[in-house]
């Protein structure tokens, strides 16, 4: 973000207690490191974005997934 | 959101230093009480995010303007 | 795959600043934050802050604050962290890694500072 | 800030051994818990992540355990090649912390 432009951050309080279709997910990142709790938001092909807790296999396994392809 | 969805949270880790003009903000919302900093999002006509501290009184008296209007 | 780059070594004065450079390359830059991490034999490993390329975000270990700037160039896929007011205390390797896992590391650079 | 105890500090074994490191928080670090290998003069790699998810790449003798904050790194069979530095690193609250190591050397 440019200098003193102070845009919100997404942060993740909670986290999805479903395991996504995996069809449904296209992209990811990882939340900001200033925020509190550890996150990787899913990104679907709807447009929605989806906090995931990193910690779970099935969101390290979507995450390799999609940097391979 | 939906339940069970779990969307990002906005939340605000700077404020701007500046007043901003009036007449580019469009809207503001407040950040949720999750995060750890008390902060106003205001939405500009370019639609641009930034980040004000709601105890500075421009940014107060901007929330009640947009509230009449 | 996936690398994060860092040059070999850095020899800098008392007093000087440095800025070191970590290139990703093989992933989408902004998906994942970068971390850089302190290796002393006294001190072991510290984690000196992260910033995520996404937005410049940046997050700083207290004993780091002031020592330590982090910034990302999304154009160029790379992380850098500057060091100031540079003393021989600064002298150690200094890596960039990838995630919260940390699972990709760069080859470290090597800081001496020295008159 | 969390707070990582490695013990032992050294650990001498015979190739073939059953090894286990063990990493211990001062307080809960949930299974934010990864182990890395550090050979001498090369950087840090990572072996197991969140406790106990395995790392394409990495022998299947390595192994994790644990949750809270008591961890253990498992080698099933040692061999020569897995001699250096171990260290656990939690990033479960900022700021992220690593253990001193433990020294995994020939007996």
């Known amino acids: 973000a440019p200098m003193g432009s102070d845009p919100p951050t997404s942060c993740c309080f909670s986290y999805t207690s479903r395991q996504l279709h995996r069809s449904f997910v296209m992209d990811y990142y990882e939340t900001s490191s200033l925020c509190s709790k550890p996150a990787v938001v899913f990104l679907t092909k709807r447009g929605r974005q989806i906090c995931a807790n990193p910690s779970e296999p099935w969101v390290t396994e979507y995450m390799s997934d999609l940097e391979l392809n | 959101a939906p339940m069970g969805s779990d969307p990002p949270t906005s939340c605000c880790f700077s404020y701007t230093s500046r007043q901003l003009h009036r007449s580019f903000v469009m809207d503001y919302y407040e950040t949720s009480s999750l995060c750890s900093k008390p902060a106003v999002v205001f939405l500009t006509k370019r639609g641009r995010q930034i980040c004000a501290n709601p105890s500075e009184p421009w940014v107060t008296e901007y929330m009640s303007d947009l509230e009449l209007n | 795959q996936v690398q994060l780059q860092q040059p070999g070594a850095e020899l800098v004065k008392p007093g000087a600043s440095v800025k070191m450079s970590c290139k990703a390359s093989?992933?989408?830059?902004?998906?994942?934050?970068i971390h850089w991490v302190k290796q002393t034999p006294g001190q072991g490993l510290e984690w000196i802050g992260a910033?995520?390329?996404?937005?410049?975000?940046?997050s700083y270990n207290q004993r780091f604050k002031g020592k330590a700037t982090l910034t990302a160039d999304i154009s160029s896929s790379t992380a850098y962290m500057q060091l100031s007011s540079l003393t021989s205390e600064d002298s150690a390797v200094y890596y960039c890694?990838?995630?919260?896992?940390?699972?990709?590391w760069g080859q470290g650079t090597t800081l001496t500072v020295s008159s | 800030d969390v707070v990582l105890t490695q013990s032992p500090a050294t650990l001498s074994v015979t190739p073939g051994d059953r090894v286990s490191l063990s990493c211990r928080a001062s307080?809960?670090?949930?299974?934010?818990l990864h182990w890395y290998q550090q050979k001498s003069h090369e950087s840090p790699r990572l072996l197991i992540k969140?406790?106990?998810q395995s790392i394409s790449g990495i022998p299947s003798r390595f192994s994790g355990s644990g949750s809270g904050t008591d961890f253990t790194l498992s080698i099933n069979s040692v061999e020569t090649e897995d001699l250096g530095m171990y260290f656990c690193?939690?990033?479960?609250?900022?700021?992220?912390?690593f253990g001193a190591g433990t020294k995994l050397e020939l007996k």
């Open positions: 690193q939690q990033s479960n609250s900022w700021p992220h912390t």
């Open positions: 969140y406790v106990s």
């Open positions: 307080q809960s670090v949930s299974k934010y």
């Open positions: 910033v995520s390329p996404r937005n410049g975000d940046t």
């Open positions: 890694a990838r995630g919260y896992g940390y699972d990709y």
């Open positions: 093989g992933y989408t830059f902004t998906s994942y934050n």
